[in-house]
Each structure stands twice: as structure tokens, then as C-alpha cells.
């Protein structure tokens, strides 16, 4: 708390300007009118105030707006934003994307702080969904943002927002998150032609079902092994040798190096050795010739 003392004669601030950097903390408290500060917040950023002086300015705004700052003030907080606590931010109602961008810019280059995380949560909750512009902004500043959302939260992302997602934004997502994002991506990119579609959908394929992989195998996509290794094992298992060969194209030779790893290992175990031999890669572990394969899951479904 700053002690309440009268402002010395002639020191009353008429505007927020450079002269204030020479004021002691108690003088700032006594001589700067909070309402003046609120209307001239945009000037604060250009003035090299000390951290202690910024504390005083924040205190003045807190007194003026005990229920939370209005957006007109929030948008111009600049470096004063770094002084805010998550508790302060929870009182705000931020609706403008410009305000969000301005405050994210202040924190740019640093890890996401609790203040920024709270701000983003408040903003997204206020909007009701992660629209394209918001997602575009958030992933531009924080590429991993998407992968910190729960599958339920991701389900509120409209397909149109998927256009804002870059491959690196999905790097840390887990399979359940991709299960939610994939159908949205499929919908978002449905009107693109074959090769363009594959480029866009590739990062999301960790959530693709078997039937979609079968469809892709008919389109000469030449999927690389890194993408293939991220596919759902249960989606890969029903694919035939011919379908995998078409899906991978020239990359099919890479299967040999991955034959002990999932999903390749499990897929090999489900294929007839005869069929695997047609690839000429020396893949071993398939079902020997003459063996009958019973699909028990099918049997259960029928009974």
C-alpha cells in the first residue's frame, strides 16, 4: 500500500508524460489522477517507468476499477500487463481480438505466463468457441496451444478454424486429440483436389479411420513413413498389402526398417506371408500359407 500524502504544490500531473519518471512513488500516488491515467494509458508504454512506479500506477487503476478494468484500458496496458495477477485478469471481460493480440505481443518471446493463460481462457470462454481468427492468433504466438486443450474443448473448434492450424501446432497432440481434430480437418479440406488435400490433411491423419486410409490409397498420395508410423494401429491393421503399397508408393521400402515397430509390426502379423513376399522387402512374421484366419471380432458382432 502506498501512503496517502498530499500532492506538493505545482506537481499535479496535467498529462501522462516523461516528467513523471522523476516522481517518487508517493508523488505519483498523490499527484496522478487515476481517471487521467485511464484515458492516457497508451502513453505509459512509451515512458521508461521503473517497476516500482508501475506498481503505483497499477494500484491507482485498481482503486478506480475495483470490479475489473474496462477493455479501453486493458487494450493499452502494454508492459503494465506483466504486473497483473491471474486474479486481476479473471475480473476482465475481453472481447476484442485486437486487445488479445496487443497483450500477447507484450509477452512475445517468453513462455506462456499464468497471466497470459488466464487471459486466453477468459477470452475463449467469452467468445464461446475457438473461431478461426482466435485460433490463428493463439497458434501464431503459442504453437502448442491446441495440444493443451482436452478432446472435449477441441470438439468446440469449428471446422473452418482448422485452416489456421500448421503441422507444428499438432506436434505434441495425443491420439485422442487427433481423433477429434481429424473429422474437422476432413470437413474443412473436403473441396480440395487430391494432392492438395493430402498435403493439408497429412498432419491430422493420426486420427483417420481405416476407410479413409483405404480411400487415400487409391489416390497416389505417396505417404512418407513418418506419417504412416503415426497412424492409428487399429486403422492400419485391416489394410491389405496392396493397399499399403499404394498408400506408401515409393516409400514402401521403408517398411523393412520399421518392421519391429508399431503399427508396422502388428500389421505384418495380420498379413499372409505370401502377400508380404510380393513386396520383395524380406518382411517376416506373416501368417504362413495354408492357415485359416478367423476374425473373432466379426464373429462376436454376428452372435
Amino acid at each position: 500500500e502506498v501512503e496517502k500524502t498530499a500532492c506538493p504544490s505545482g506537481k499535479k500531473a496535467r498529462e501522462i508524460d516523461e516528467s513523471l519518471i522523476f516522481y517518487k512513488k508517493w508523488e505519483l500516488e498523490a499527484c496522478v489522477d487515476a481517471a487521467l491515467l485511464a484515458t492516457q494509458m497508451d502513453r505509459v508504454n512509451a515512458i521508461p517507468f521503473t517497476y516500482e512506479q508501475l506498481d503505483v500506477l497499477k494500484h491507482k487503476l485498481d482503486e478506480l476499477y475495483p470490479q475489473g478494468y474496462p477493455e479501453s484500458v486493458i487494450q493499452h496496458l502494454g508492459y503494465l500487463f506483466l504486473k497483473m495477477s491471474p486474479e486481476d485478469i479473471r475480473k476482465w471481460n475481453v472481447t476484442s481480438l485486437e486487445t488479445l493480440k496487443a497483450l500477447l505481443e507484450v509477452n512475445k518471446g517468453h513462455e506462456m505466463s499464468p497471466q497470459v493463460a488466464t487471459l486466453i481462457d477468459r477470452f475463449v470462454k467469452g467468445r464461446g468457441q475457438l473461431d478461426k481468427d482466435t485460433l490463428d492468433t493463439l497458434t501464431a504466438f503459442y504453437p502448442g496451444y491446441l495440444c493443451s486443450l482436452s478432446p472435449e474443448e477441441l470438439s468446440s473448434v469449428p471446422p473452418s478454424s482448422i485452416w489456421a492450424v500448421r503441422p507444428q501446432d499438432l506436434d505434441t497432440c495425443d491420439p485422442r486429440q487427433l481423433d477429434v481434430l481429424y473429422p474437422k480437418a476432413r470437413l474443412a479440406f473436403q473441396n480440395m483436389n487430391g494432392s492438395e488435400y493430402f498435403v493439408k490433411i497429412q498432419s491430422f491423419l493420426g486420427g483417420a479411420p481405416t476407410e479413409d486410409l483405404k480411400a487415400l490409397s487409391q489416390q497416389n498420395v505417396s505417404m512418407d513413413l513418418a506419417t504412416f508410423m503415426k497412424l492409428r494401429t487399429d486403422a492400419v491393421l485391416p489394410l491389405t498389402v496392396a493397399e499399403v503399397q499404394k498408400l506408401l508408393g515409393p516409400h514402401v521400402e521403408g517398411l523393412k526398417a520399421e518392421e519391429r515397430h508399431r503399427p508396422v509390426r502388428d500389421w505384418i502379423l495380420r498379413q499372409r506371408q505370401d502377400d508380404l513376399d510380393t513386396l520383395g522387402l524380406g518382411l517376416q512374421g506373416g501368417i504362413p500359407n495354408g492357415y485359416l484366419v478367423l476374425d473373432l471380432s466379426m464373429q462376436e458382432a454376428l452372435s
Epitope: 506462456m112 499464468p114 488466464t118 502448442g144 493443451s148 472435449e152 505434441t172 495425443d174
Partner: nanobody, 115 residues
């Protein structure tokens, strides 16, 4: 810089239960996905389960109904309760945190299931 430290690894009997812990060095984050992965010798790292900041969780089919993820926010601890353990559960177990949009990994703890 957030740090993750796993503990609780060791030798477990087949059919037995075991709990792994992961200490999280900070607790001020508001948005997270905390996960457990494992890596068996000569195999790739495998995702097991996640818990998210809205309290929901998700599991890989291979561990569903046997493993349970939980988070004690007061103690800054992530847990993995493993039941009905099998020899094929032998691996190095890693905790992972996608916290406020950045990913972090622990150093791993070895779990061996054998009689």
C-alpha cells in the same frame, strides 16, 4: 523452466499393481495436458494416457481398464496407477506435460514386470 521428475519404478510381479509418480516443479499453469508414455527396449515411444485441465482423461486401448491417470494439484503430483500388470508392460515410463502450450519431458523410470 518446468521440470518433471518420475519416481516409483521397480520390479513388479505379473498380475500385480504399481503406482508411478511424477513431480511437477511449478503449479501456476492454468491450461495443461499431462500425459504418460512408455518405451520398451527396441520399440518406439507409446502414448498411454492423458489428463487435461478440464478434468477429463483419455486412454490408449492397450491400457484402458488397467491403468488410471490422476493429478493432485495441491501436491503438484501426477500419478499412474497400474493394475493387472503383464510382462509386456515392461518399459521405461515417462511423464510429459503440455503446459500453457509448451511440451516438457521427464527423464523416465524403469518398470520391469517379471516373476
Amino acid at each position: 523452466q518446468l521440470q518433471l521428475v518420475e519416481s516409483g519404478g521397480g520390479l513388479v510381479q505379473p498380475g500385480g499393481s504399481h503406482r508411478l509418480s511424477c513431480a511437477v516443479s511449478v503449479s501456476t499453469f492454468t491450461r495443461y495436458a499431462m500425459r504418460w508414455y512408455r518405451q520398451a527396449p527396441g520399440k518406439e515411444r507409446e502414448w498411454l494416457t492423458s489428463i487435461y485441465s478440464d478434468g477429463s482423461s483419455a486412454y490408449a486401448d492397450s491400457v484402458k481398464d488397467r491403468f488410471t491417470i490422476s493429478l493432485d494439484n495441491a501436491k503438484n503430483m501426477l500419478y499412474l496407477q497400474m493394475n493387472s500388470l503383464k510382462p509386456e508392460d515392461t518399459a521405461v515410463y515417462y511423464c510429459n506435460a503440455n503446459v500453457d502450450s509448451k511440451a516438457y519431458w521427464g527423464q523416465g523410470t524403469q518398470v520391469t514386470v517379471a516373476s
